[in-house]
């Protein structure tokens, strides 16, 4: 090896060099000095470095590793935020125009109901909205909530409208009477089942997004140990001290070093791998009965199908209310009333199946392929560092932390630095507690995302087949796949314009509101804008 | 006539356990989310539990989570708060309240004339 | 969770007006939750006078009103009768569902 070059006989470069980084000369000595008190660029001759020096190294090099790790993580970070914000608030859209499809439906089909039903409906969606951004609301209480509240309006309004004032106080009677007698038929379960199964798969996306941004945000923001700091000192700065200031460090020693800086970090790759592959597994299966979307736009469908139900049955219905509730006053008000075989729908209720076109669906599988782009994130940093900062090309005339060498030797390397710092001893350590905490959570999300992960092929579970609908029935190239009254299935050609209609807000009165009867053929309203054909929720 | 009508209250050591119940009548109770508010002498109101329609989401204020239990059996029409290690800064008349609505919080339409528990050696 | 930040008194004569104010935070009232406003007259349990911010139960007079924006909400009392001397709490829930009150008006008509 070559002895290594005369240092600069008055530390002149260096000088200037460390100027930069503390302005002010006290600390660097004007000519080279033996250098006893140095504890990490330890000299093999004079040495153009102060003790003061070597800490201001130290501080520098953790500093220059924190921002190196942040621009390594911008590209993924704004990836991962920018997609969480969109898809919140594209949910939310969705949300207000499921509202709004629904308001619209009781507006044009059944106008006496209104404005109790706007207030019913307004106080579910807000539920919705809420369970989406992770309030602890249960899903059938919420659908229970939404029909106990709209019998008692559809009973003394559409089915009993003579009723005199005074007979208002059967409310109470009515709620009770429209779980006990079943009055909407199946259809409340089947909303449960819909929304309760989109609705966590949404939440779980949505949490899953998030957790990538804290992801990011802990491993962005990590502060390395001093043991770190010096090893990155000697590999940046050390040979400054002998006065080498055009030298670069071997690529191959800065990659022995950055394993060493981010073995804690690294650690995270494993579940990180799994986190991406898990919410791609969340996102294939999220169609049908699990795309939020595609459930909730169709739900006005389903809501107009059960009152039509409950119509349907009114003869029925009113004479065992009138029965049930004549003297309400005396009535115990609890479930405890199931007449034989009342009403039981076996009707063929096939689920919603939506259009997509640029919808949320295909925005949701564009993010995914992007982030596989990143599935080696984490076991790729070390390298990714080495290639951003400044490293010899091919690993000659180079810096190994001790001295200039043609050809770097991790073996030599690490001999060199036996006495000076243990490499080995820093990778088993194990990764920080902020680390190791996210790792929990990861681990977490990881698990939840599997247990979510729909099975290929299946719309309905089994437990609805009991219950007397069919499951299955919607093939991929049906249109015609909402609701089921028979009088003309309602097809939804979604096609919510993603980003710009995520400027758009919508009230109920810019819902279709053309009050006259439509056959289905006539349900095609180029309406909403930029929604494109969006079928009208007429009858 | 819609009631509301709270048992259970009284004189009990720190520490201790204490169950109050309260009996609902006039309505359908299973439709409704239920609440026990608390209110020390001469303090302002202080929720304290809630339960949904069905019994499937509770919820609980800071000072009282891991040591009180909401529940509902709406065969019986009647909500419970079970009190567990008991403390003085618990002393209060905790009312028993109806939701207007079923799902979770929102107004409570409908109170008791409530229990007076107090904690104290 | 942190209560709502009321007034702790307020007073008026008869036929005067009384208006009190309830302020929470973005994620309480100024989230897409409802304000409601309770009556209470000592050793008494509390009334629903106002839910969904704005709407009275029946039975409850007009002259109790209720309206929100933003972060607060406030309770108006027009036309102010002995009657309505009491202790009045404003309430909403956080994102979490809890349920949040405020540390009670007491109301004085003079």
């Known amino acids: 090896q070559p002895p290594p070059p005369p240092p600069d006989a008055t530390c002149h470069q260096v000088r200037s060099f460390f100027q930069r980084l503390q302005p002010g000369l006290k600390w660097v000595p004007e000519t080279p000095v033996p250098g006893s008190d140095l504890q990490v660029c330890l000299p093999k001759g004079p040495t153009c470095c102060s003790r003061k020096m070597e800490e201001k190294y130290q501080l520098t090099a953790r500093l220059n590793m924190e921002q190196l790790l942040q621009s390594a993580s911008m590209e993924l970070k704004f990836l991962i935020i920018q997609n969480a914000a969109v898809f919140q608030e594209a949910f939310e859209i969705v949300v207000r125009h499921a509202k709004n499809y629904t308001n619209a439906m009781f507006k044009n089909n059944y106008p006496s109901l209104t404005p109790q039903a706007f207030e019913f409906v307004g106080e579910f969606f807000t539920d919705v909205s809420l369970y989406i951004l992770g309030s602890d609301i249960n899903v059938d209480d919420m659908v229970n909530e939404l029909f106990d509240s709209l019998f008692p309006v559809i009973y003394t309004q559409l089915m009993n409208p003579g009723l005199p004032d005074s007979a208002l106080d059967i409310n109470e009677c009515l709620r009770g009477a429209r779980r006990d007698l079943k009055v909407f038929g199946n259809f409340p379960k089947l909303i449960m089942t819909q929304v309760s199964k989109s609705l966590q798969v949404t939440r779980i996306f949505l949490q899953a997004l998030n957790l990538g941004i804290e992801v990011i945000n802990t491993t962005d923001h990590l502060k390395f140990s001093k043991d770190c700091g010096r090893m990155l000192t000697r590999m940046w700065y050390c040979s400054y001290c002998q006065g080498l200031m055009m030298v670069k460090p071997c690529g191959g020693y800065c990659n022995v070093v950055m394993q060493g800086c981010m073995a804690g970090v690294v650690e995270i790759d494993k579940y990180w791998r799994e986190y991406i592959l898990s919410l791609e597994e969340l996102v294939n299966g999220m169609y049908r009965i699990y795309d939020m979307e595609n459930v909730l736009l169709g739900l006005f469908s389903t809501i107009h199908d059960s009152i039509q139900y409950v119509q349907k049955n009114a003869g029925k219905l009113t004479t065992t209310i009138g029965k049930l509730c004549a003297h309400s006053q005396q009535r115990q008000y609890r479930s405890a009333y199931y007449p034989e075989d009342l009403f039981i729908d076996k009707k063929v209720l096939k689920v919603a199946h939506v259009e997509h076109e640029e919808t949320l669906s295909s925005r949701r599988r564009e993010l995914i392929q992007k982030l596989k782009s990143f599935i080696s994130f984490y076991s790729a940093l070390p390298g990714y560092i080495c290639s951003h900062s400044p490293v010899a090309e091919n690993d000659t005339l180079c810096w190994n932390g001790q001295e200039l060498v043609e050809r770097y030797s991790q073996k030599a390397a690490r001999n060199g630095m036996k006495n000076q710092f243990n490499l080995h001893e820093l990778k088993m350590k194990g990764p920080e507690p902020v680390v190791s905490q996210i790792i929990d959570k990861l681990k977490h999300i990881n698990q939840l995302l599997r247990t979510m992960s729909m099975p290929k092929g299946r719309v309905l579970d089994k437990n609805l087949d009991e219950e007397g609908f069919e499951s299955g029935d919607c093939g991929d190239d049906e249109d015609e796949c909402i609701g089921g009254s028979g009088d003309g299935m309602i097809k939804v050609k979604n096609q919510l314009r993603f980003l710009a209609e995520l400027a758009y807000d919508l009230d109920v009165d810019d819902a279709p509101g053309n009050s006259q009867q439509a056959t289905p053929k006539d349900n095609e309203i180029s309406t909403f804008h930029n929604l494109g054909n969006v079928h009208s929720p007429l009858k | 006539q819609v009631q509301l009508q709270e048992s259970g209250g009284g004189l009990v050591q720190p520490g201790r356990s204490l169950r109050l119940s309260c009996a609902a009548s006039g309505f359908t109770f299973s439709s409704y989310a239920m609440h026990w508010v608390r209110q020390a002498p001469g303090k302002g109101l202080e929720w304290v539990s809630a339960i949904s329609s069905s019994g499937g989401s509770t919820y609980y204020a800071d000072s009282v989570k891991g040591r009180f239990t909401i529940s509902r059996d709406n065969s019986k029409n009647t909500l419970y708060l079970q009190m567990n290690s008991l403390r003085a800064e618990d002393t209060a008349v905790y009312y028993c309240a109806k939701d207007r609505r079923g799902s979770h919080a929102d107004a409570f339409d409908v109170w008791g004339q409530g229990t007076l528990v107090t904690v104290s050696s | 969770q942190s209560a709502l930040t009321q007034p702790p008194s307020a007073s008026g004569s008869p036929g005067q007006s009384v208006t009190i104010s309830c302020t929470g935070t973005?994620?309480?009232?100024?989230?897409?939750?409802?304000v409601s406003w309770y009556q209470q007259y000592p050793g008494k349990a509390p009334k629903l006078l106002i839910y969904k911010s704005s709407s009275r139960p029946s039975g409850v007079p007009d002259r109790f009103s209720g309206s929100k924006s933003g972060t607060s909400a406030s309770l108006a009392i027009t036309g102010l009768q002995a009657e309505d001397g009491a202790d009045y709490y404003c309430q909403s829930y956080d994102s979490s569902l809890r349920v949040v009150f405020g540390g009670g008006t007491k109301v004085t008509v003079l």
């Open positions: 973005s994620s309480d009232v100024g989230l897409m939750h409802n």
